[in-house]
């Protein structure tokens, strides 16, 4: 797909006048809550505070420059960016002993891209090289979309860094939630 | 035996609040999210949120999004839905309903409904 | 959100006819489709969930298929206790959504 080759370490992202665009929360990678190896004790408990903080699935707006290369957009183009949580924690303490790990109590939603837009944007290139026209796919919204523990890895690349869910027939062992993703709990709407 | 119990009716001037009790007892409250559904009279069913009885987060339906919390109370295993600013169209019956899940097939469904409690809104 | 457009809105039949509800979400919701029957004056009862899996307890005449954004609702053979509005659900996408409902009354 000829749009993701704009979408590389030399695009240039600016944040538009009056957003200060935060990165979406650290979804844990390899911290699969795992009874063997944690001792069924998460590092802190997520569930400590009741505080409810504005937290959702939202869209950032962003401006960047699309790059192919040494040629850059004469213009900027301004996409979305999917960022944020859909929904309260969907995880519940189960004591184990006296030790506890962690299972869902609800599906797993993901903040993720919904529609797209096509933008044909025009690059222009040093050493008096032609100007070239290209079209990009750019974010147009964004939806809480399901993530099933059935989604293998090259899947859940489109839903950012997520621990796979465990394969069919085995049960499922929720990862304990981050500090930060837990300093309040969430309140959201869809 | 499982079961949901709500708080009986209430008739409402436009502009009150209303609060929406949901007791549940035959399984451990604290196990199950508790989600709310509306139906209003000739409309279809309408999901308006969810609640960990844990922690207290909720997420709720952008439609009622600044006029609807739902709260807890897990000493008494209760789940509390109020509504504010109540309108005309907010007249519907509103249930309480627990999320059960299909370990195989990674499924989640509303599996036990309270017996509604119906909100007429009107001056 | 996602729509889900049930169809018809409402239907006449008789005690051993074969009835058939469809249900189109928007978009697409894999098997995420659940199905419940209403009466007047109680809360909705859960028949099928994950398109085609039968509630426990729920008798076999019930049967949903589908994928995607089609999905059916069949009734092999209706029964006087079978008049009532059915409801589909989606559980792909928040906010959960669910059909507008189909009305099966008694001919």
């Known amino acids: 797909q000829g749009w993701q080759a704009f979408k590389n370490d030399a695009t240039e992202i600016i944040p538009e006048l009056g957003e200060y665009p935060e990165p979406p929360p650290e979804l844990e990678n390899n911290k699969t809550m795992n009874r063997a190896e944690n001792g069924g004790r998460p590092p802190h408990h997520p569930f400590e505070t009741k505080d409810v903080s504005e937290y959702s699935c939202r869209e950032l707006h962003f401006t960047r420059y699309v790059t192919d290369g040494p040629c850059r957009s004469a213009k900027p183009v301004t996409e979305l960016v999917c960022s944020g949580q859909c929904g309260p924690a969907r995880l519940l303490p189960n004591a184990i002993g006296r030790g506890k790990w962690w299972r869902p109590s609800g599906p797993d939603f993901r903040c993720i891209p919904d529609r797209y837009r096509a933008q044909r944007v025009q690059l222009l290139c040093p050493g008096g090289e032609a100007p070239r026209a290209r079209k990009v796919r750019l974010v147009a919204s964004c939806k809480c979309k399901r993530l099933t523990r059935f989604h293998n890895q090259s899947e859940l690349k489109d839903f950012g860094t997520e621990a796979a869910r465990p394969q069919k027939g085995r049960k499922p062992r929720p990862r304990a939630r981050s500090a930060k993703a837990n300093q309040a709990e969430l309140e959201n709407a869809y | 035996e499982v079961q949901l119990v709500q708080s009986g009716a209430e008739v409402k001037k436009p502009g009150a609040s209303v609060k929406v009790s949901c007791k549940a007892s035959?399984?451990?409250?604290?196990?199950?999210?508790m989600h709310w559904v509306r139906e209003a009279p000739g409309q279809g069913l309408e999901w308006m949120g969810e609640?960990?009885?844990?922690?207290?987060?909720?997420g709720y339906n952008q439609k009622f999004k600044g006029r609807v919390t739902m709260t807890t109370d897990t000493s008494t295993s209760t789940a509390y839905m109020e509504l504010r600013s109540l309108r005309s169209d907010d007249t519907a019956v509103y249930y309480c309903?627990?999320?059960?899940?299909?370990?195989?097939?990674?499924?989640?469904?509303?599996?036990?409904w309270g017996q509604g409690t119906t909100v007429t809104v009107s001056s | 959100d996602i729509q889900m457009t049930q169809s018809p809105s409402s239907l006449s039949a008789s005690v051993g006819d074969r009835v058939t509800i469809t249900c189109r979400a928007s978009?697409?919701?894999?098997?995420?489709l659940n199905w419940y029957q209403k009466k007047p004056g109680k809360a909705p009862k859960l028949l099928i969930y994950?398109?085609?899996r039968l509630l426990s307890g729920v008798p076999s005449r019930f049967s949903g298929s589908g994928s995607g954004t089609d999905f059916t609702l069949t009734i092999s053979s209706l029964q006087p206790e079978d008049f009532a509005t059915y409801y589909c659900?989606?559980?792909?996408?928040?906010?959960?959504?669910f059909g507008g409902g189909t009305k099966v009354e008694i001919k």
């Open positions: 309903a627990r999320l059960g899940y299909d370990d195989i097939y990674d499924d989640w469904y509303f599996d036990v």
């Open positions: 035959g399984y451990t409250f604290t196990d199950y999210n």
């Open positions: 609640i960990n009885p844990n922690s207290g987060g909720a």
């Open positions: 978009q697409d919701i894999s098997n995420y």
């Open positions: 994950y398109t085609s």
């Open positions: 659900q989606q559980g792909d996408t928040l906010p959960y959504t």
